[in-house]
């Protein structure tokens, strides 16, 4: 966080929605009203929502927004029929622009978009679009919710009646009715190409007050595929002055957005003000807390058949208007701790948001490199009670990388957790990492300004003179469908080991190709001898949708003296490289493109060594690695076998078995569990209902005590 002293008065920041002045002689624009005395406000802290009422009395009113909409209490309003949209199917003109207001990112619409119907008193003209989002990995960011369900992003389109007012600002200042549409964005496994111009624009307004013209887009394509199911209620602006003048139209169905595209929102910066000190921070969680309904009634549209079908028509759509094909946001708080000289414990916390609860188990993948040999193993750790696993037989001179995926009941996976590095026998460790997409992996020291703090903190642990060092990688690593044919270790061999020698060295590359293309499906209970996989370079991965070679328009729309100090990279990486990330949640950034999924089809399926669950204590020796790695779920509640010599008694050890040996049978093994990794990315439940409930985890529920623990050493892959 950069702090600097400002000389202008502290309480002079404008409203998010303040639209006035001329912009290059055309129309209105968003401008911070530094001199007008509009009260400063923020989304947290001393000027946060609970304090808005101090300077904007309306914020304490009884008809405030946003609200949670309870479907079962919403009455069907016969007056709420089909929306009539006019101009929404046209491409936007090149005068449409985007601005980072410091509180949101706003799109100033320069074309004629009209809406009528839906009980609106007249024909309303669209003025601007604003966005609200969370902090990372699809966390809840919407302002409104349906049945308690919040979404990663909410887009709001604001309208005014041009027959009554010459401008949107006039309508607001005269406290007259305006219209607003709320559209939810939900996580999808694939990029939504309709959002490309918006995402591209976001990369041009990374910094507070930046402006950029937008590539043409079709506003209708940013709305849900079906507009028939919507809610209506009367509320307010969700930012000061909180005027209670808004006729809200909240669409039931979301629009898809990928994790990759979400990153563009999470990469936006703002400046915040405390006393006379300004700080540059990420603009995240820019949503107002929900307000009481009081005496209001929420209505739902009466469009025939819009509410009562089972979404199958939408689910056939490859993107799906209800987009999430992921189990949950990634597991968080990844940690790796040495237990002794030969064993590591990987631990994590439950994902913050679970789209398809419950989580039934976790898949732990770990990769290592030694003597230019790369290996990778994946195993499934049953259930969710004890969120840790022990990796035994750790070789002190290998570099390890760990990551975890949650698996939901319907076999969907979460995105991968942050990736953790572990290197034994190393006293120099990374002080920070920065993930940048490059064509060829390279390692080079990074300038101190380029550093981002490590989420778990750097740590060194020594036992019997052997120092262990580990560091977390600031990667989101892409969705579960991404990956390629190289292990992390293969890239690390050439790119990271050198970096370990640098004091404060940074990793300049972590391509998407560092994980295998296909992981076994969640139901897979087999283990396989990890086979070396060819390393590839980023060039093999299919370019991301924003990976074009044309420069961004960053700065095009800025006024004199406001041009970018440096332009965005072609790959759309964060512009603000010199600003360290704020905290651990800032880390989980995707710095990679999605590898070509076609490769998934070409890899041979490994055959299981036996149709049974992995035997307790049984595992396979990996050829070319003189000491095998046995991964076992940590069981602190009993049911352990005696530990082997030299090992922590808390750990289950294993008997080495030749690579071709079948697993031992043991009481309670489950012959019915399918053992074969499936080529199909999601074997069942991969439909995602528009109504699917998801759970945002209540920290109080994160109880890790537990019954019934299965200490079998996982289903080794």
């Amino acid at each position: 966080v950069l702090h600097y002293v400002v000389c202008f008065p502290a309480l002079t920041e404008g409203y998010v929605g303040a639209l006035h002045e001329n912009r290059h002689g055309s129309a209105v624009q968003i401008r911070r009203r530094k001199a007008s005395g509009d009260p400063y406000w923020a989304y947290s802290g001393a000027y946060g929502p609970e304090h808005w009422v101090t300077s904007s009395v309306s914020c304490g009113g009884r008809h405030q927004s946003p609200i949670d909409i309870l479907d079962q209490y919403a009455r069907v309003g016969e007056e709420y029929q089909e929306l009539q949209l006019d101009g929404f199917d046209n491409e936007s003109s090149n005068k449409t622009w985007m601005k980072n207001t410091g509180k949101t990112v706003a799109i100033l619409l320069k074309d004629d978009y009209f809406v009528s119907g839906a009980g609106l008193p007249g024909r309303f003209k669209a003025e601007k679009v604003e966005f609200h989002w969370g902090h990372s990995n699809g966390s809840a960011g919407s302002e409104h919710s349906i049945n308690g369900r919040r979404f990663p992003v909410e887009m709001q389109i604001f309208f005014y009646n041009p027959d009554d007012f010459d401008s949107f600002q006039t309508a607001i200042s005269e406290n007259r009715i305006i219209g607003a549409m709320a559209i939810f964005f939900q996580v999808s496994p694939r990029d939504n190409s309709a959002l490309d111009p918006i995402i591209h624009g976001l990369k041009g307004v990374v910094h507070h007050e930046k402006e950029t013209f937008l590539d043409p887009f079709v506003l209708r394509d940013l709305l849900p595929a079906s507009l028939g199911s919507y809610y209506r209620y009367t509320g307010s602006l969700t930012t000061p002055p909180c005027s209670e003048i808004v006729e809200w139209i909240v669409f039931r169905r979301p629009v898809p957005i990928s994790y990759h595209q979400l990153e563009a929102f999470y990469s936006i910066f703002t400046t915040e003000q405390q006393d006379h000190v300004k700080s540059v921070e990420y603009l995240r969680n820019n949503f107002r807390p929900q307000q009481r309904l009081h005496d209001r009634v929420v209505s739902k549209s009466a469009v025939r058949d819009s509410w009562n079908h089972d979404m199958t028509d939408f689910l056939e759509n490859p993107l799906g208007t209800e987009a999430s094909k992921v189990c949950s946001s990634p597991p968080i708080h990844m940690k790796v701790q040495p237990l002794n000289q030969t064993a590591l414990q990987v631990s994590w916390s439950q994902p913050e948001t679970i789209y398809h609860p419950p989580i039934m188990n976790y898949m732990i993948s770990y990769s290592w490199t030694k003597n230019e040999d790369e290996k990778e193993k994946t195993f499934t750790k049953d259930s969710d009670k004890d969120l840790k696993a022990t990796i035994s037989h750790v070789s002190p001179d290998s570099l390890y990388l760990f990551r975890v995926q949650a698996v939901c009941r319907n076999d969907m996976r979460s995105d991968f957790s942050q990736t953790m590095l572990f290197q034994a026998n190393t006293t120099r460790i990374f002080q920070g990492t920065r993930i940048v997409k490059t064509g060829v992996p390279t390692a080079s020291p990074a300038s101190s300004a380029d550093m981002a703090p490590i989420s778990s903190g750097s740590s060194t642990w020594t036992s019997s003179g052997i120092p262990f060092s580990f560091v977390s990688m600031a990667t989101g690593m892409g969705p579960s469908s991404s990956g390629s044919q190289a292990t992390v270790a293969s890239v690390v061999t050439s790119t990271l080991l050198a970096g370990l020698g640098f004091g404060g060295g940074g990793i300049s590359s972590f391509p998407s190709t560092v994980w295998p293309t296909r992981l076994p499906t969640a139901a897979s209970a087999s283990k396989q001898a990890a086979r070396p996989v060819l390393a590839t370079t980023e060039a093999l991965a299919s370019p991301g949708p924003d990976g074009d070679s044309s420069p961004t328009k960053d700065g095009e729309g800025t006024e004199e003296g406001e041009k970018d100090e440096k332009s965005e990279s072609e790959d759309g990486e964060r512009e603000h490289e010199e600003d360290g990330e704020k905290d651990s949640e800032k880390k989980e950034k995707s710095g990679v493109t999605h590898a070509a999924e076609e490769r998934n089809q070409t890899e041979p399926s490994p055959t299981p060594s036996s149709p049974n669950r992995t035997a307790e204590g049984g595992h396979q020796t990996i050829p070319g690695h003189e000491q095998d790695h046995t991964a076992v779920p940590t069981d602190q509640t009993g049911g352990r076998r005696d530990a082997g010599p030299g090992l922590d008694p808390d750990m289950v050890t294993s008997t080495q078995v030749p690579p071709t040996a079948t697993e031992e049978q043991y009481a309670g093994s489950d012959p019915k569990r399918p053992e074969m990794p499936s080529k199909k990315p999601m074997s069942r439940g991969d439909r995602f209902s528009e109504d699917s409930r998801f759970i945002t985890v209540n920290p109080a529920e994160k109880n890790t005590s537990g019954m019934i623990s299965r200490p079998a050493p996982g289903r080794m892959e």
Partner: antibody, heavy 120, light 111 residues
């Protein structure tokens, strides 16, 4: 008031196809999962299968192949179809609403049950 | 599929404390829930997530777990507690997902 009720029970002949319906009220199948559980006279509870809020169905190992669970959200109904019934399928059949948490599932609301008797 | 084992019957004196156990043959790490069923009635959820009590369930009922055993404890047993008690848990994902009940314990309250 949230509740559910099973219907369709009665006397069936061996090899018949059994079709039971669970009608819910006060909550939506679009955001809730339903399990079917049966209990033979004098015996314990036996899970048959479930359908989650997105329409995915899951079955007990013994029920796979001859049981099908579907839903009609607009009608607020979940249907259990079981083919080739035998006397061993004689039981009271319950539908129960699942309480799905982040990391656990339990059955927090049960219908009164419907008795199915298989006899020639 | 895994099996949950419960004692077939347990007796307790009125006002005494009794513990009903549920042991898994293989150690699923899923949470256990407990159900009470009185004759001729549908089961009722007593305990979920090993230890949590739904609203309306008296605090005489408590749950715990250790290793591969979940335990339901009833303190100050009353005549109205006479019923069958079932533990349950879930396991697996996708086509291998299962929800499993224990065989049930018939609790008799004497005295």
């Amino acid at each position: 008031q949230e509740q559910q009720k099973e219907s369709g029970g009665g006397l069936f002949k061996p090899t018949d196809t059994l079709t039971l319906t669970c009608t819910v009220s006060g909550f939506s199948l679009s955001s809730n999962a339903i399990s079917w559980v049966r209990q033979a006279p004098g015996n314990g509870l036996e899970w048959i299968g479930a359908i989650d809020n997105s329409g995915s169905a899951y079955y007990a190992t013994w029920a796979k192949g001859r049981s099908t669970i579907t839903r009609a959200t607009n009608l607020n109904t979940v249907t259990l179809k079981m083919t080739s019934v035998t006397a061993a399928d004689t039981a009271t059949y319950f539908c129960a609403r699942e309480d799905v948490r982040a990391d656990s599932i339990d059955l927090n609301m049960w219908g009164p049950g419907t008795l199915v008797t298989i006899s020639s | 599929s895994f099996v949950l084992t419960q004692p077939a019957s347990v007796q307790v004196n009125l006002g005494q404390t009794v513990s009903l156990t549920c042991t898994a043959d293989t150690l699923s790490r899923s949470y256990a829930s407990w159900y009470q069923q009185k004759p001729g009635q549908a089961p009722v959820l007593l305990i979920y997530r090993d230890t949590s009590r739904p609203s309306g369930v008296p605090d005489r009922f408590s749950g715990s777990s250790s290793g591969n055993t979940a335990t339901l404890t009833i303190s100050g047993a009353q005549a109205g507690d006479e019923a069958d008690y079932y533990c349950a848990t879930s396991d697996g994902s996708g086509s291998s997902y299962q929800f499993v009940f224990g065989g049930g314990t018939q609790l008799t309250v004497t005295g």
